[in-house]
Interface confidence: medium
C-alpha cells in the first residue's frame, strides 16, 4: 500500500545502477591514456633510415600544470616485464632522448648530441611520437621501448610504455627498403577499446542529464501514486505496522504516524547493494591507483600474421 512496489523499488535500483555505470563510464577513462605501437616489427636493410613510432591514446589532460615526458630506450625480451631494463640507444640514455611538453603538442630533440649520433626523437599534435635512426647497422637490431609519463606539478602521475622489434639485415636476404609488420590483433582490440572508452566517456557525460531526468520523473510518478494511496487509506491508518512509515513517540498519549517524504526515502535507499561502495572501495574503477598499481601492463606484441607494409 504505502510501501513501494517491487517494480518501483527495482526501477530505483536500476536507476542507481545506470547512474553508477554512466558515472564510471564518464570518470573512469579520464586517467586511462595508453601507448599503442602501430608496428611491432621493423625489418630494415643496413644503411637505411627508420622511424619507430608510438601513439598516445585516450583522453589527455591539457591542463596548464600537466606535461608529458616521452622518451626512448633499448631493452631485452628475456625478462619478467618487457621494457623494465633500460639500455642506451647508440650510447644515448633515455634521459638524453627525452621530450617534455604539454598534451598533444609538437616537440623534438633540438640538441646536437642526438643528431651527432644519427638520432632524432619527435612528437606531433596528434599524440604520435617517434625516434628516427639514420644509417642503420647490424648493432641497431633489438627491442626498442617508448615511455610516456604524465607529470603534474613536477611529479609523475601515470606511466605507460610500448615495445617494438627492429631487425637490421644484411646480404641477399635483406629487403631493399624497411618492411613493417602491424601489431597483433590483440593490440588493435586494445586500441579500439581505448577509442570506445573515450566514446563512452563522451556519451556518458551527454546522457547523464537525461538519465537523471528519467530517474527523477520515475520517482515523482511513484511518489504521486503513493500520495494518492495515502489519502485513500487515511481513515484506517492507525495501528498498522508498515515499513513505509515510522512510528513517532506518542504526543499526549495519542499514537501518530509520520509519513516519510519521498526524498528522504530515496536518501535512505541510496546505500544499496549496487551503489554502496562505488566511491570508497579500493578496487573500483573510480579509485586512484595504489602506489604499486600499473595502469596498463605493457603489451608484448609478437607478429602473429604475415601482414606487412613496405615503408
Amino acid at each position: 500500500m504505502g510501501v513501494p512496489t517491487a517494480l518501483e523499488a527495482g526501477s530505483w535500483r536500476w536507476g542507481s545502477l545506470l547512474f553508477a555505470l554512466f558515472l564510471a563510464a564518464s570518470l573512469g577513462p579520464v586517467a586511462a591514456f595508453k601507448v599503442a605501437t602501430p608496428y611491432s616489427l621493423y625489418v630494415c636493410p643496413e644503411g637505411q633510415n627508420v622511424t619507430l613510432t608510438c601513439r598516445l591514446l585516450g583522453p589527455v589532460d591539457k591542463g596548464h600544470d600537466v606535461t608529458f615526458y616521452k622518451t626512448w630506450y633499448r631493452s631485452s625480451r628475456g625478462e619478467v616485464q618487457t621494457c623494465s631494463e633500460r639500455r642506451p640507444i647508440r650510447n644515448l640514455t633515455f634521459q638524453d632522448l627525452h621530450l617534455h611538453h604539454g598534451g598533444h603538442q609538437a616537440a623534438n630533440t633540438s640538441h646536437d648530441l642526438a643528431q651527432r649520433h644519427g638520432l632524432e626523437s619527435a612528437s606531433d599534435h596528434h599524440g604520435n611520437f617517434s625516434i628516427t635512426m639514420r644509417n642503420l647497422t647490424l648493432l641497431d637490431s633489438g627491442l626498442y621501448c617508448c615511455l610516456v609519463v604524465e607529470i603534474r606539478h613536477h611529479h609523475s602521475e601515470h606511466r605507460v610504455h610500448g615495445a617494438m622489434e627492429l631487425q637490421v639485415q644484411t646480404g641477399k636476404d635483406a629487403p631493399s627498403n624497411c618492411v613493417v609488420y602491424p601489431s597483433s590483433s590483440q593490440d588493435s582490440e586494445n586500441i579500439t577499446a581505448a577509442a570506445l572508452a573515450t566514446g563512452a566517456c563522451i556519451v556518458g557525460i551527454l546522457c547523464l542529464p537525461l538519465i537523471l531526468l528519467l530517474v527523477y520523473k520515475q520517482r515523482q510518478a511513484a511518489s504521486n501514486r503513493r500520495a494518492q494511496e495515502l489519502v485513500r487509506m487515511d481513515s484506517n491508518i492507525q495501528g498498522i505496522e508498515n515499513p513505509g512509515f515510522e512510528a513517532s513517540p506518542p504526543a499526549q498519549g495519542i499514537p501518530e504516524a509520520k509519513v516519510r517524504h519521498p526524498l528522504s526515502y530515496v536518501a535512505q535507499r541510496q546505500p544499496s547493494e549496487s551503489g554502496r561502495h562505488l566511491l570508497s572501495e579500493p578496487s573500483t574503477p573510480l579509485s586512484p591507483p595504489g602506489p604499486g598499481d600499473v595502469f596498463f601492463p605493457s603489451l608484448d606484441p609478437v607478429p602473429d600474421s604475415p601482414n606487412f607494409e613496405v615503408i
Epitope: D65, D96, H100, V149, H154
Partner: antibody
Framework: EVQLVESGGGLVQPGGSLRLSCAAS????????MSWVRQAPGKGLEWVAS????????YYPDSVKGRFTISRDNAKNSLYLQMNSLRAEDTAVYYC???????????????WGQGTTVTVSS | DIVMTQSPLSLPVTPGEPASISCRSS???????????LEWYLQKPGQSPQLLIY???NRFSGVPDRFSGSGSGTDFTLKISRVEAEDVGVYYC?????????FGQGTKLEIK
C-alpha cells in the same frame, strides 16, 4: 663534479629589477629540473621557483608569482631568475639548486650553489 | 599552503648520543601517485644547504648511515644514531608533494 655558481646579486631599490644567473657544470644540464631557494638574513629557507628540464613548465609560490620569472637556456647550461617589482622582504641570499629527475618525477634538490646576495633597500 | 612544523627548534646534544628531530605537516603529504616527497636538508654554519634524506627514508649518496628518516602521512622524524661534531647546523624538513613546496622553520643542532 657538479657545480652551480650564482651571480647577479646586488643592491637594488624597492620597485627595481634584478636578474640572477646560475651557471651549471659537471652534469647534463638539460636532463634536470632546477630551483631557486632563498634565505632572508637570520631566517629559514623559502622555495622561490622551479622549472622542469625542458623548460616549458614553471612553478612559483604566491609570494613571488607575477613578479619573478624563472627560465633556462639549455644550450648555455644556464638558469635565470628575473626579479621585478622588488620589495624589502625579497632581501635574501638566493641559491640555485638542481632537482633530481627520475622519468619526469622531480624531487630532491641534490646540489646547491653557494648563493648570491640580493639587498632591496632605499 | 602546507605548513611544516619542526620540533624542537633547538637541540643541544652530547657527541656520541642519539638525536631526533620531528616534523609535522598541516595536512597529508602523500602525493596522488603514492609517493611522499618529504626531504631533510642540513645547512652547516656558513654553507649552502645539503640534501640528507629524500622520499621520507632514502639516504642521499655520501650521507653517513647514522642518519635515518621515517614517518608517514603527516608525522616524520629524522634520527641521528650517534651525533658527531660535524653534524652541527640547522636541519630543515621540506615537502615537495604539493605546490607551493614548503620548508619547516629549522632545528638548530648544537654540541653541548
Amino acid at each position: 663534479e657538479v657545480q652551480l655558481v650564482e651571480s647577479g646579486g646586488g643592491l637594488v631599490q624597492p620597485g627595481g629589477s634584478l636578474r640572477l644567473s646560475c651557471a651549471a657544470s659537471g652534469f647534463t644540464f638539460r636532463n634536470y629540473g632546477m630551483s631557486w631557494v632563498r634565505q632572508a638574513p637570520g631566517k629559514g629557507l623559502e622555495w622561490v621557483a622551479s622549472i622542469i628540464s625542458g623548460g616549458s613548465y614553471t612553478y612559483y609560490p604566491d609570494s613571488v608569482k607575477g613578479r619573478f620569472t624563472i627560465s633556462r637556456d639549455n644550450a648555455k647550461n644556464s638558469l635565470y631568475l628575473q626579479m621585478n617589482s622588488l620589495r624589502a622582504e625579497d632581501t635574501a641570499v638566493y641559491y640555485c639548486a638542481r632537482i633530481y629527475d627520475h622519468d619526469g618525477d622531480y624531487y630532491a634538490m641534490d646540489y646547491w650553489g653557494q648563493g648570491t646576495t640580493v639587498t632591496v633597500s632605499s | 599552503d602546507i605548513v611544516m612544523t619542526q620540533s624542537p627548534l633547538s637541540l643541544p646534544v652530547t657527541p656520541g648520543e642519539p638525536a631526533s628531530i620531528s616534523c609535522r605537516s598541516s595536512q597529508s603529504i602523500v602525493h596522488s601517485n603514492g609517493n611522499t616527497y618529504l626531504e631533510w636538508y642540513l645547512q652547516k654554519p656558513g654553507q649552502s644547504p645539503q640534501l640528507l634524506i629524500y622520499k621520507v627514508s632514502n639516504r642521499f649518496s655520501g650521507v653517513p648511515d647514522r642518519f635515518s628518516g621515517s614517518g608517514s602521512g603527516t608525522d616524520f622524524t629524522l634520527k641521528i644514531s650517534r651525533v658527531e661534531a660535524e653534524d652541527v647546523g640547522v636541519y630543515y624538513c621540506f615537502q615537495g608533494s604539493h605546490v607551493p613546496w614548503t620548508f619547516g622553520q629549522g632545528t638548530k643542532l648544537e654540541i653541548k
